[in-house]
């Protein structure tokens, strides 16, 4: 299953399959997730080691048993790959690292006014993988405001150095935020020239394209079909690059298919997995296990659940079958692709779905009246769980926020439905940033069921929580995916990085905002909060957040939206925007429904609604 916990001051011994430099443990974990053999990783921050060569070292590891011995190492961080973790699988990494220079091949330099502008330039350059920016206070005046665009053979820095007044980060192309745009077409009977960066075997051109999309240096590809004239080259997928970023030439060639990486697509990237099953094909590789199962789909599920399995063949040969069950061969290779593809067999083959980010139809947990005042504009995909709850009567308007917690589930505040309990009048918009982008053609979800907490009473602040079951499940994308829920009764975690988001009023007597706003707000203890609200009872099922001096807060229109906190690199839904005295007033924190206190209720309702377990626990 999915294991998300990180181990502080621990280092996994042995099992190394690759090493690289990464700026933090989260990026190291992402590289492990996308590496075909990596199950575990260990990361050495600069503070953890004197050996300059090993600082920022990210060590990717494999293990036949799925685990390795941990040794104590002060400062080291270790953890698991996020394979099998559904919507948490993403190659998108937005963080900017201050005081760090990520080294690589510098191929472009320009003057820009901010690190965000530098990141944008990198994202809009086809070859840029990461960048460094010298701030206005950099010690050498001639380098100030320099934006260096970089690449490397492996897509990660060739070295990382601690350097004051330098900020570094990665291209946001994997976040589907590139302005370049992409070529979706594939071209039959056409071969591209230029430099081959890798060669793998694939059953079709789509798999070849997806592998190209997630390969750090592939910009385009040529695939030799199973009817290519040279038998030894059939099903070969050549991943390619060029100095210019486009093929320098193409040659008409029967039984080849060529195309482009989709990494530069805006708003949508292909999933990093291949779910099609190929009849009449045998995928060769190292044998991991053989099991008898009923049907090719069960074989694929078996492969997906066995974390080291990369691909499978389900044999229908009479000698491989007993009654209704046949042999399911679970296999792997060094690069994650079959070492041999044979046609004309009595079987079907396919890939593990361990990197699919759709996951199962569940809400996400982890084991371990009121817009934003004083906030700033959010960017695309920054808060992909945020939804807008809108009511269409004669006109249509935004009333509340909400949080996507599963393919078919939204969590919001009960008071949003005060006086409007009819599910037919509601429209739920997900994967949006600007309310003005919503037109009559914009897709929306309708409500199948509104489940208001049984103890909620109108005009009282208690139990202000409601679940919405959508009529149809939503697909997950970089712009539309769920927020993980805290563990039941989560009181031990100290959250220091919390944010509230919404389209609500920017001042008490304001109006709904167009662009989704965000504000960083510290949590306040319930004791402190109770002092500020002596006329109300602040219960243990509430959580408060705000600045003593005011100025930043949620407000009308943000109700039901998320209070999220980042802990160990993972966002969790800590609160639901509920109520407060005015907006952003001095010494009047916002009050939020404490989600951890309602985990039993959420689990009960999401499970009983359609009779099957809807919860998935990454840990």
């Amino acid at each position: 299953g999915c294991l998300t916990q990180l181990y502080e001051n621990a280092f996994f011994r042995g099992g190394d399959v690759a090493s690289m430099y990464t700026p933090n443990a989260q990026y190291c974990q992402m590289r492990c997730t996308f590496h075909p053999r990596c199950l575990l990783f260990s990361f050495l921050p600069a503070s953890s080691i004197n050996d300059m060569e090993k600082r920022f070292g990210c060590f990717l590891k494999d293990s036949v048993t799925g685990t390795l011995p941990k040794v104590h190492r002060t400062g080291a961080v270790s953890g698991h790959s996020l394979k099998q973790c559904g919507h948490q699988i993403s190659a998108c990494h937005r963080d900017i690292y201050k005081g760090v220079d990520m080294r690589g091949v510098n191929f472009n330099v320009s003057k820009v006014s901010s690190v965000e502008e530098c990141q944008k330039r990198c994202t809009s350059n086809i070859r840029c993988q990461f960048f460094s920016y010298a701030t206005q206070t950099f010690h050498k005046a001639e380098y100030r405001n320099n934006c260096l665009l970089k690449y490397s053979p492996g897509g990660t820095p060739t070295a990382i150095k601690v350097l004051s007044n330098v900020e570094s980060g990665f291209s946001l192309k994997p976040c589907a935020l590139s302005e370049i745009g992409c070529h979706m077409n594939i071209f039959q009977h056409l071969a591209f020239s230029d430099v081959d960066v890798a060669r793998v075997l694939t059953p079709d051109a789509f798999v070849c394209r997806t592998i190209c999309t997630y390969h750090p240096n592939c910009l385009f590809f040529t695939f030799y079909t199973n009817v290519w004239k040279i038998e030894s080259q059939r099903n070969v997928c050549l991943l390619k690059t060029s100095e210019s970023g486009t093929p320098s030439s193409s040659t008409p060639q029967e039984n080849t298919i060529s195309g482009y990486s989709l990494l530069t697509c805006k708003r949508t990237l292909p999933e990093p997995c291949h779910s099609k099953i190929y009849p009449g094909v045998d995928f060769g590789g190292e044998e991991l296990n053989v099991t008898f199962v009923k049907g090719v789909n069960v074989c694929q599920e078996t492969c997906t659940k066995m974390i080291r399995c990369q691909f499978f063949t389900y044999s229908l040969l009479p000698e491989d079958c007993k009654e209704e069950k046949c042999k399911c061969f679970l296999r792997l290779s060094m690069d994650g692709s079959p070492t041999r593809i044979a046609y004309g067999t009595q079987g079907s083959s396919g890939y593990s779905l361990r990197l699919c980010n759709t996951g199962d139809n569940s809400v996400c947990t982890t084991k371990t009246s009121t817009r934003i005042v004083g906030g700033t504009n959010s960017s695309w995909g920054e808060w992909p769980w945020q939804v807008s709850l809108q009511v269409k009567l004669t006109a249509q308007r935004h009333l509340c926020g909400g949080s996507l917690i599963g393919h078919q589930w939204v969590l919001t505040a009960a008071h949003c439905f005060d006086g409007l309990p009819l599910q037919d009048v509601w429209r739920i918009y997900s994967g949006i940033l600007n309310l003005s982008d919503i037109t009559k053609d914009t897709p929306f979800s309708q409500i199948k069921e509104i489940i208001i907490h049984q103890n909620y009473k109108v005009s009282e602040g208690n139990h202000d929580i409601a679940l919405i079951k959508l009529q149809a499940p939503l697909n997950y994308t970089e712009f539309q995916k769920p927020i993980c829920l805290p563990s039941k009764g989560d009181t031990s975690t100290i959250y220091t990085n919390c944010w509230v988001t919404g389209w609500g009023f920017s001042k008490e007597k304001g109006e709904i905002q167009n662009i989704l706003q965000k504000v960083n707000i510290p949590l306040v203890t319930n004791e402190e909060c109770q002092k500020r609200y002596q006329d109300y009872k602040i219960t243990q099922r509430m959580v408060c957040a705000g600045y003593k001096e005011g100025g930043k807060d949620a407000c009308k229109g943000d109700s039901g939206g998320p209070l999220v906190c980042k802990h160990n690199g993972m966002w969790r839904l800590v609160g639901i925007t509920s109520w407060g005295e005015g907006c952003a007033r001095r010494e009047q924190p916002g009050v939020y429904t404490k989600v951890a206190e309602y985990m039993d209720w959420i689990l009960e309702k999401t499970q009983s609604s359609d009779g099957k377990a809807q919860m998935q626990s990454p840990a």
């Epitope: 079909t225 199973n226 009817v227 099609k276 099953i277």
Partner: antibody
Framework: EVQLLESGGGLVQPGGSLRLSCAAS????????MTWVRQAPGKGLEWVSV????????DYADSVKGRFTISRDNSKNTLYLQMNSLRAEDTAMYYC?????????????WGQGTMVTVSS | DIQMTQSPSSLSASVGDRVTITCRAS??????LNWYQQKPGKAPKLLIY???SLQSGVPSRFSGSGSGTDFTLTISSLQPEDFATYYC??????????FGQGTKLEIK
């Protein structure tokens, strides 16, 4: 010239049998998956059966499973459809088609079709 | 099995018009979608493969787009020879290869 030519259609009584043939020319036949698609008069296209390269793997639409058998003779560049226990609802124009290479599975070459009429 | 639903089922348009036909899959089929044109008494002809790629010899006024569950076939400027029935077909979950029910494009 790349082409497919069907034959073997005709009038048959319910419960009877027919064998359709599809002769391929102008391309190397053996590495391609081949399919049969039918179209009842005034209706849409319905996929009937597929046979993958080398003939090792076949599959059928539920409506014909157990009654129809697809086969190929790569030495003769010919595809066959053996139809048994025919029913009135099997009346249709039957087309053979080539599936483009490596599981894109677009049917890029079609025959002109052969008509099968099942009637008493 | 995956169901393919085309809309509209019939459509009247004039020469020079821009025409769009949509096809929706009952579940995600990635880009494994093909479009065919069929004229009365003739075999179908492949127009678009892999959702958006133009088959060799097909005029560039035909284009396809979409991925996942929603796809469109667009004819940018309708010509007299384009009046026909159009079918979408998925090749993702195979077999069976399922076709849409067809869209008949008629002269207004």
């Amino acid at each position: 010239e790349v082409q497919l030519l069907e034959s073997g259609g005709g009038l048959v009584q319910p419960g009877g049998s027919l064998r359709l043939s599809c002769a391929a020319s102008g391309f190397t036949f053996s590495p391609y998956a081949m399919t049969w698609v039918r179209q009842a008069p005034g209706k849409g296209l319905e996929w009937v059966s597929v046979i993958y390269p080398s003939g090792g793997f076949t599959d059928y639409a539920d409506s014909v499973k157990g009654r129809f058998t697809i086969s190929r003779d790569n030495s003769k560049n010919t595809l066959y459809l053996q139809m048994n226990s025919l029913r009135a609802e099997d009346t249709a124009m039957y087309y053979c088609a080539r599936a483009s290479g490596s599981y894109l599975d677009a049917f890029d070459i079609w025959g002109q079709g052969t008509m099968v009429t099942v009637s008493s | 099995d995956i169901q393919m639903t085309q809309s509209p089922s019939s459509l009247s348009a004039s020469v020079g018009d821009r025409v769009t036909i949509t096809c929706r899959a009952s579940q995600s089929i990635s880009s494994y979608l093909n479009w065919y044109q069929q004229k009365p008494g003739k075999a179908p002809k492949l127009l678009i493969y892999a959702a958006s790629s133009l088959q060799s010899g097909v005029p560039s006024r035909f284009s396809g787009s979409g991925s996942g569950t929603d796809f469109t076939l667009t004819i940018s400027s309708l010509q007299p020879e384009d009046f026909a029935t159009y079918y979408c077909q998925q090749s993702y979950s195979t077999p069976p290869y399922t076709f849409g029910q067809g869209t008949k494009l008629e002269i207004k």
